[in-house]
Interface confidence: low
């Protein structure tokens, strides 16, 4: 399973606006994230942005905004001024460096057939956004609850109204669950059209950040901004996930080699569980 996932999305409302999402699955503290286009940084690629957990971010045109989404994922908004977007056929690469245990890079691109106007992809692909999952999931729970309440009220006017207990769901939990297909589904990693069943269980969902910043004691913890659940979030076009491999710029003092990602997801609604980080020293 790759250590890094990459997802390229076209905004539904703006055909010339793209967002690159990247995340790191391995245990260890992220020391630097580099986003490039046209290939990997240093191998024909051109730097678009560099994100440092302590020193901030830098970006170069046509990057519009680079930001941390969680402790282990970033997003980069791109603005294309041209009429026909060059991004559609461009490869974007994200390199997560975790000094000195290693660095991992994966690349992704937007399929040429992407239709930003679609409200849902023509075939199931693992591109469910955290904020949308939260909104849809919570809305569904609330709607169902309200409907059920109304039903009970109409049928049993003389009985006390059952009281709804709100589910405790935090944004990190939503993030962990919503990104589940991209992070842990073997089928999705190797077949971009694999069917993913993403069940949403807000009452039981717990979080896992296997690459928590605290695993390297000398690193200051990065406080993620968290995914922004804005009402204007567009419906996503099809994206693609291209796994490259582990160990690009793998560095000294690496942890013992992975046997898989540091995040295991369970289909039975127990939510993600952290696999203990195998951290040697980076």
């Amino acid at each position: 399973t790759p250590e890094v996932w990459v997802q390229v999305q076209m905004e539904a409302t703006e055909l010339s606006s793209f967002t690159v999402h990247c995340g790191f699955l391995g245990p260890g503290s992220i020391s630097l994230v580099t986003v490039s286009w046209g290939g990997p940084d240093g191998a024909g690629g051109t730097k678009l942005a560099v994100l440092h957990p302590e020193l901030g971010t830098r970006q170069w045109a046509p990057a519009r905004q680079a930001r941390w989404e969680t402790q282990s994922s970033i997003s980069l908004a791109l603005e294309d001024s041209g009429a026909s977007s060059p991004f559609a056929n461009t490869t974007f690469c994200c390199k997560f460096a975790s000094f000195p245990e290693g660095s991992w890079e994966s690349c992704g691109s937007l399929p040429p057939s992407s239709d930003p106007g679609l409200s849902a992809p023509p075939t199931p692909v693992p591109i469910l956004r955290a904020d949308l999952a939260g909104i849809l999931g919570l809305s569904g729970v609330l709607l169902f609850g309200c409907g059920y309440l109304l039903h009970l009220l109409r049928r049993q006017k003389h009985r006390p109204t059952p009281r709804l207990q709100p589910s405790h769901t935090n944004s990190q939990a939503l993030t962990a669950q919503a990104w589940a297909p991209s992070q842990a589904s073997q089928a999705a990693l190797h077949d971009p059209y694999a069917t993913i069943n993403t069940s949403f269980c807000p009452a039981t969902l717990d979080t896992a950040h296997p690459n928590g910043w605290a695993s390297l004691p000398t690193h200051a913890a990065h406080q993620p901004q968290g995914p922004a659940a804005s009402a204007s979030t567009p419906i996503l076009a099809r994206g693609s996930f291209v796994s490259v491999e582990n160990g690009l710029y793998t560095q000294a003092g690496e942890r013992p080699p992975h046997t898989g990602p540091g995040l295991t997801l369970f289909p039975d609604c127990r939510g993600p569980r952290a696999v203990e980080g195998r951290f040697g020293v980076r």
């Epitope: 020391s31 630097l32 990997p40 940084d41 240093g42 191998a43 560099v50 440092h52 302590e54 020193l55 000094f99 000195p100 290693g102 660095s103 890079e105 000398t218 490259v244 491999e245 582990n246 160990g247 690009l248 710029y249 793998t250 560095q251 000294a252 003092g253 690496e254 013992p256 080699p257 992975h258 980076r282």
Partner: antibody, heavy 115, light 107 residues
Framework: EVQLQESGGGSVKPGGSLQLSCAAS????????MSWIRQSPEKKLEWVAE????????YYPDTVTGRFTISRDNAKNTLYLEMSSLRSEDTAMYYC????????WGQGTLVTVSA | DVVMTQSHKFVSTSVGGRVSITCKAS??????VAWYQQKPGQSPKLLIY???YRFTGVPDRFTGSGSGTDFTLTINGVQAEDLAVYSC?????????FGGGTKLEIK
Amino acid sequence: EVQLQESGGGSVKPGGSLQLSCAASGFTFSSYGMSWIRQSPEKKLEWVAEISSGGTYTYYPDTVTGRFTISRDNAKNTLYLEMSSLRSEDTAMYYCARGDPFGYWGQGTLVTVSA
Amino acid sequence: DVVMTQSHKFVSTSVGGRVSITCKASQDVMTAVAWYQQKPGQSPKLLIYSTSYRFTGVPDRFTGSGSGTDFTLTINGVQAEDLAVYSCQQHYSTPRTFGGGTKLEIK
């Protein structure tokens, strides 16, 4: 214990070729990126090549691009550096190293390019 | 390419003393700088990475500091076995580049 052992060095005439090998042990070779670094007789260190864990990506500085080729055989836990069109300025001690920054180095193999 | 410059070829101190070795990058490399120690007849060994983090087994008398373009390796309580050449390296961008090295001499 991480161990890296270079071999294949020797004397060669300008324009000649040489292949260096680096046998790795003590860690899961296929999980890590590897590099070659050289040290000139003046003791100046220069990174000359890097390869990703699966061999998909290779990186070189301009000084050796087109002349040097880094490769690896993960089944044999071995890293290679194929050097061609050698020049006198390629004379150096060549080290293989794991990672970046380079946490583990071999003992080096000497390459001498001289007429 | 990022040029790493170590302006002092030699530094000298007595056993038990303190010495600082400096390195300057030609452009901002954030905190992506490593320090290596190379004793006579040996291959280099990583001491410090990412400016200030000690590598496995490195004594705490070795400390690194700096950010941006100016970096320092400090050795407190210098021991006789610290006689070596110390080189900096940036691991911020490709190609990775090294400083010319600074030799520590013991008085």
